[in-house]
């Protein structure tokens, strides 16, 4: 049995044909209509495709998997008797003609037929798994469908829903922008006739503006031979008076020449009971020379002369030599009492200074020296301290020892540079050095990374300019 | 002698950070402002930013304000320089420096090595 | 910012003869203006400070003028030693700004 031939016989039947030496044995069986040919074969592990096929086409399949199930089953059927009725027919011809040796060619052929139905039986049972799997993607596949379609018809109801809202809006707006046009022209119109009366107005006060500038021309021309009546008023009552004070003292030697009242400092000031802030007018110590000065009487027990103040940027501090010996700026807000003032008064007796500083966060601080003083201008107001206390930093931001006083136009600092120059203001810098009080004024926000700001270094570091300092003085034994 | 030693070069993904530092020795490390400056391939000389240590107080350019961050250590005498959100433009070689005076950021008298950061992806 | 405009780029000298270097600032800087020498590989060293003042160790080659926008760093006598970039930097106005450079190579 070493040849086993299968091929297709003239009416299309298969014909399975077995050989073993002279004897040769022909199985005629019977081919379906529907089952497949050999030329397309069969793969049972096929990949089934992804994409959702069309609904119609899937059920015309379906149909014709059904019809090919139905055929294999009755092709199985037949095959199965077929094979019956011809191993009853074989196995008598064997008994009859078959040699005893030839037994085992039969159960061979047996053998292939069984393995036969398996294979059929087995393909059967992988289109039935095929067509189950398919008839469940087909299922979902529907239920899907039905999903998206209800989703849709919700989302359809939901739009519809939202045009009617915002049609109802639009036309409400339209109504609002009508009403906000025809007040917007009521408005226009009133005013119109505002700007009508103001013109009125306008012209009614520039007449009268006229009318007092010539008044005050005439006023002025009055003032001036009212200040010369004054003058001439006040020389005959000094002579007056001199005439009093002579006769006086000649008839009564007793009663001394009453001298006129004048203050050195904010300490005398405010020992003569004057305990309100505000200016006050000093006189130069050994001099009829006056200056007005700011006089702190509350904090600290009070008494002191402010003799610098920045709160602002009001003023600028960038001045001449001159301008710092005699001061500047308005007492009762940024100003500079004046170096000269400053060296004649702290040179008569010992003096401390209190410097106040705030920072842009609200922070305050102080510096306290308990002895300070300025040299004479010869020796470029040059400052002298001593005694450092309080919250400003434990060490002192004014250099020690004192250093000359600069200008942008009086260059006595230690640095190459001119300081005043660099980070503009008088001070008493070093090279140069850790403060400047008469720095730019920067606001807030600017005032980070500013090296010719208001600067107090052992309080707030090296670019960080302040917000507002008060220099003060007052006698060390008030 | 006056030194200023950094830390070595570094390799860095875009939108991570790098923190690098300078050891100084020779001087009183509070006596001094610290400022660090980058180079970039072919580019200017750019300022950063500075340190004073005697109080912490911090300045930056605002070119890099936000993304740049300057410490100092006093006990190690050592300044750190940390830069966030890296992008590529920022592959530079970043110096540390001494400034001349405590008080006032003016020139620069003594320079670290330099680190090379690269920030590739 | 102040810009420092360099002037020119690079600069080719035979040695012993003098190189001048230019800065411009786009506005007044006062004496603010420092110049730095680098050479490959390695960082910035100060050679002058307030326009005009040498560093400790400079040769006295090494010079500088120029106050308000005009500044000039002048090496009178070029050695081999001195072929490096040149940088001007300005620290009267925050930020603190350089120029680009000047490239000085031995002609």
């Known amino acids: 049995y070493n040849n086993f031939r299968k091929s297709m016989d003239s009416i299309g039947k298969k014909q399975y044909q077995v050989q073993h030496g002279s004897c040769s044995y022909t199985f005629l069986l019977p081919e379906m209509d529907n089952c497949r040919s050999s030329s397309s074969p069969y793969v049972s592990n096929a990949v089934q495709r992804d994409a959702p096929l069309e609904y119609d086409d899937s059920v015309q399949r379906l149909q014709v998997l059904e019809n090919i199930m139905e055929n294999n089953t009755q092709w199985l059927m037949k095959l199965e008797n077929y094979i019956q009725d011809n191993m009853k027919k074989e196995m008598v011809e064997i008994q009859q003609n078959a040699v005893q040796n030839q037994t085992a060619v039969m159960i061979e052929i047996g053998t292939n037929l069984l393995n036969q139905t398996a294979e059929q039986t087995r393909k059967l049972t992988d289109v039935e798994a095929q067509v189950l799997n398919q008839t469940t993607r087909l299922e979902l596949q529907l239920l899907e469908h039905s999903l998206s379609t209800n989703k849709l018809e919700k989302q359809i109801l939901d739009q519809t829903s939202e045009i009617n809202k915002l049609q109802d809006k639009n036309s409400f707006l339209e109504k609002k922008v009508l009403a906000m046009e025809d007040k917007h022209i009521i408005q226009l119109q009133s005013i119109k006739e505002e700007k009508d009366q103001l013109q009125v107005l306008v012209s009614k006060q520039n007449s009268i503006i006229e009318e007092l500038e010539k008044k005050i021309v005439t006023a002025t021309v009055n003032n001036s031979v009212l200040q010369k009546q004054q003058h001439d008023l006040m020389e005959t009552v000094n002579n007056l008076l001199t005439m009093m004070s002579t006769s006086n003292s000649a008839k009564d030697p007793t009663v001394a020449k009453e001298e006129q009242i004048s203050f050195r400092d904010c300490a005398e000031v405010f020992k003569s009971g004057h305990t309100t802030n505000g200016i006050y007018t000093l006189t130069f110590p050994n001099s009829t020379e006056e200056i007005k000065a700011y006089c702190d009487m509350e904090a600290g027990g009070g008494g002191w002369t402010i003799i610098q103040r920045r709160e602002d940027g009001s003023v600028d501090f960038q001045r001449t030599w001159k301008e710092y010996k005699v001061g500047f700026g308005n007492p009762s807000g940024e100003y500079w009492l004046g170096n000269e003032f400053v060296s004649q008064l702290t040179n008569q007796q010992r003096y401390v200074l209190k410097i106040h500083l705030k920072d842009w966060e609200g922070n305050e601080a102080y510096s306290l020296y308990e002895h300070f003083y300025l040299s004479s201008e010869e020796l470029n107001y040059r400052i002298h301290l001593k005694g450092l206390t309080g919250t400003a930093g434990k060490i002192s931001s004014i250099s020690q020892p004192g250093n000359d006083f600069s200008t942008k136009d009086g260059d006595n600092d230690k640095c190459i540079c001119k300081c005043s120059q660099m980070l503009t203001g008088g001070w008493w810098f070093d090279a140069c050095g850790p403060s400047n009080l008469n720095g730019m004024y920067y606001p807030q926000r600017q005032n980070t990374n500013k090296f010719n700001g208001i600067k107090w270094y052992y309080w707030k570091g090296s670019g960080y300019s302040l917000k507002a300092t008060t220099m003060m003085i007052r006698p060390a034994d008030f | 002698q006056v030194q200023l030693v950094q830390s070595g070069a570094e390799v860095k993904k875009p939108g991570s950070s790098v923190k690098v530092s300078c050891k100084a020795s020779?001087?009183?490390?509070?006596?001094?402002?610290m400022v660090w400056v980058r180079q970039a391939p072919g580019q200017c000389l750019e300022w950063m930013g500075y340190i004073d240590p005697y109080n912490g107080g911090t300045g930056y350019n605002q070119k890099f304000e936000g993304r740049v961050t300057i410490t100092a250590d006093e006990s190690t005498s050592t300044a750190y320089m940390e830069l966030s959100s890296l992008r590529s433009e920022d592959t530079a070689v970043y110096y540390c420096?001494?400034?001349?005076?405590?008080?006032?950021?003016?020139?620069?008298?003594?320079w670290g090595q330099g680190t090379l950061v690269t920030v590739s992806s | 910012d102040i810009v420092m405009t360099q002037s020119p780029d690079s600069l080719a000298v035979s040695l012993g003869e003098r190189a001048t270097i230019n800065c411009k600032a786009s506005q007044d800087v006062y004496i603010a203006v420092a110049w730095y020498q680098q050479k490959p590989g390695q960082p910035p060293k100060l050679l002058i400070y307030?326009?005009?003042t040498r560093d400790t160790g400079v040769p006295d080659r090494f010079s500088g003028s120029g106050s308000g926008t005009d500044f000039t760093l002048t090496i009178s006598s070029l050695q081999a030693e001195d072929v490096a970039v040149y940088y001007c930097?300005?620290?009267?106005?925050?930020?603190?700004?350089f120029g680009c450079g000047t490239k000085v190579e031995i002609k």
């Open positions: 307030w326009a005009s």
């Open positions: 420096a001494r400034t001349r005076d405590r008080y006032d950021v003016w020139y620069f008298d003594v």
């Open positions: 020779g001087y009183s490390f509070t006596d001094y402002n």
């Open positions: 930097h300005q620290y009267s106005s925050y930020p603190p700004t």
